[in-house]
C-alpha cells in the first residue's frame, strides 16, 4: 500500500505582494511525472487545470487566496498551503517613522510607527530581504510595531502597507522606505 | 441557445448495464466540465462524476466508483455515462449538466441541466 | 445521508419571508467554497438560482438572495409567491476528494 500523496508547494513569482499592473506567475509543485494540477482561487468557485498560471497584469479582482492540488491516478493530493496574492498600490502610500528616531544604539528600543490619513485597521511592515512580513511568521496588524532591545540584525530598510480588514488583500502603495541603522 | 438532451435510460436487470448519452448543443462543448446528476424517485440530487474540458480530469462519487465511467466526445458534442453492474439504488432520473466557465477558468457550479432520463433497475 | 444538511421543509404564507438554511464542514464551505443555490418546480430538472453564495442569474427576481458565513449559507425569499412552491437545493465542493456535494433538499410550502 502506498502512502498519502504529499502535498505541492505554490508559490507566487517574483512576490506575493504585486503592484497592481504588474506581471506575476502562481506555480503549483508537486512531485516528479505530476501533470494532472487543479489550481484554486478560494472564495470565488473558479478553477484552472494548470499548473502555472500567469498573470500579465495584476487587477484586483485577481487578488485573494490561492490554493492547488494534484490528481495521481483518481487519487487527489491533500492541497498546498494557502497562498495569499495581494495587489498592492490600490491606495495612497502610508508613511513610516522611527521614534524616537531611525538611528537606535544596540540594546536600545525602537518603535516605527505606520501613519495613513485614510480609516484602515490594518498594517504589515516588511524588511527589505524578507520574504514575509516583520515578525514572521505573525503578521502584526497594527500602527506601532516596537522593537524591544535592537540589535544589529535590525539594521535595514523598512516599509509599511496599510489596508481594510474588510478587503484584506488590497493593499496600499509602499510607504517610503525608512532606513534603520544600529550603532 | 444552450441545449443538453439526454437519452439511453431504461429498464434493467440488477447487474446489467446501460449507457447513457447527452447531446449538446448551443456552446463550445470542448470549453466545459461536464457533469451527470442523478435523483432518486422522491429524493434529493446526487452528483455522480465529472469529467473536464478535455477529458482528462475525472472524478466519481464513492457509490459509483468502480462501476460507472464517464467520458466525452468533443467531436461529437456529446457525454457518456457507461453504468456496469447496476444495483436497484441507482434507480433515478440522470441528468446532464454544464459546468460554468469564463475565459481561463471553470467554476464549481452548474448552469445548464438537461431534462433527465429514467433509468430503472428492477428485476 | 447528504453531505450538507438543509431542513426538509419550510412554508410561509403568500407575501411573507422564509430562510432556508445549509450547513455543511471545514473541508467544503468552511475550506472556502462558495455555495450555490438551485430551484426544481414540480416535474422538471433543477435550475440556476443562487451563484457564489449571493449572485442572481440574469432572470432570477431579486426576491431571492443568498449568504454565507463560515460553515453555513442560506437562501432567502422575501415577497413569497404561489409559483415559489418548489424544491431548493443548496450545492457546493469538497476538498477531500474534490467532489461536488448537494444538500438533502428542501420543499417549500406556500401556504393559502
Known amino acids: 500500500q502506498r502512502g498519502p500523496l504529499p502535498k505541492p508547494s505554490l508559490q507566487a513569482l517574483p512576490s506575493s505582494l504585486v503592484p497592481l499592473e504588474k506581471p506575476v506567475t502562481l506555480r503549483c509543485q508537486g512531485p516528479p511525472g505530476v501533470d494532472l494540477y487543479r489550481l484554486e482561487k478560494l472564495s470565488s468557485s473558479r478553477y484552472q487545470d494548470q499548473a502555472v498560471l500567469f498573470i500579465p497584469a495584476m487587477k484586483r479582482h485577481l487578488a485573494g487566496r490561492y490554493r492547488c492540488s494534484y490528481q495521481n491516478g483518481s487519487l487527489w493530493s491533500p492541497p498546498s498551503d494557502q497562498l495569499e496574492l495581494v495587489a498592492t498600490g490600490v491606495f495612497a502610500k502610508p508613511s513610516l517613522s522611527a521614534q524616537p528616531g531611525p538611528a537606535v544604539s544596540s540594546g536600545g528600543d525602537v518603535t516605527l510607527q505606520c501613519q495613513t490619513r485614510y480609516g484602515f485597521d490594518q498594517f504589515a511592515l516588511y524588511k527589505e530581504g524578507d520574504p514575509a512580513p516583520y515578525k514572521n511568521p505573525e503578521r502584526w496588524y497594527r500602527a506601532s510595531f516596537p522593537i524591544i532591545t535592537v540589535t544589529a540584525a535590525h539594521s535595514g530598510t523598512y516599509r509599511c502597507y496599510s489596508f481594510s480588514s474588510g478587503d484584506p488583500y488590497l493593499w496600499s502603495a509602499p510607504s517610503d522606505p525608512l532606513e534603520l541603522m544600529v550603532t | 441557445q444552450v441545449q443538453l438532451v439526454e437519452s439511453g435510460g431504461g429498464l434493467v436487470k440488477p447487474g446489467g448495464s446501460l449507457r447513457l448519452s447527452c447531446a449538446a448543443s448551443g456552446f463550445s462543448f470542448s470549453d466545459h466540465y461536464m457533469s451527470w446528476i442523478r435523483q432518486a424517485p422522491g429524493k434529493g440530487l446526487e452528483w455522480v462524476s465529472s469529467v473536464g474540458s478535455e477529458g482528462k480530469f475525472i472524478d466519481y462519487a464513492a457509490s459509483v466508483k468502480g462501476r460507472f465511467t464517464i467520458s466525452r466526445d468533443n467531436a461529437k458534442n456529446s457525454l457518456y455515462l457507461q453504468m456496469n453492474s447496476l444495483r436497484a439504488e441507482d434507480t433515478a432520473v440522470y441528468y446532464c449538466a454544464r459546468h460554468y466557465r469564463e475565459f481561463r477558468w471553470h467554476y464549481y457550479y452548474f448552469d445548464y441541466w438537461g431534462q433527465g432520463t429514467l433509468v430503472t433497475v428492477s428485476s | 445521508q447528504s453531505v450538507l444538511t438543509q431542513p426538509p421543509s419550510v412554508s410561509g404564507a403568500p407575501g411573507q419571508r422564509v430562510t432556508i438554511s445549509c450547513t455543511g464542514s471545514?473541508?467544503?464551505?468552511?475550506?472556502?467554497?462558495?455555495v450555490h443555490w438551485y430551484q426544481q418546480l414540480p416535474g422538471t430538472a433543477p435550475k440556476l438560482l443562487i451563484y457564489?453564495?449571493?449572485n442572481r442569474p440574469s432572470g432570477v427576481p431579486d426576491r431571492f438572495s443568498g449568504s454565507k458565513s463560515g460553515t453555513s449559507a442560506s437562501l432567502a425569499i422575501t415577497g413569497l409567491q404561489a409559483e415559489d412552491e418548489a424544491d431548493y437545493y443548496c450545492q457546493s465542493h469538497d476538498l477531500g476528494a474534490h467532489v461536488w456535494v448537494f444538500g438533502g433538499g428542501t420543499k417549500l410550502t406556500v401556504l393559502g
Open positions: 471545514s473541508s467544503n464551505i468552511g475550506a472556502g467554497y462558495d
Open positions: 457564489g453564495n449571493s
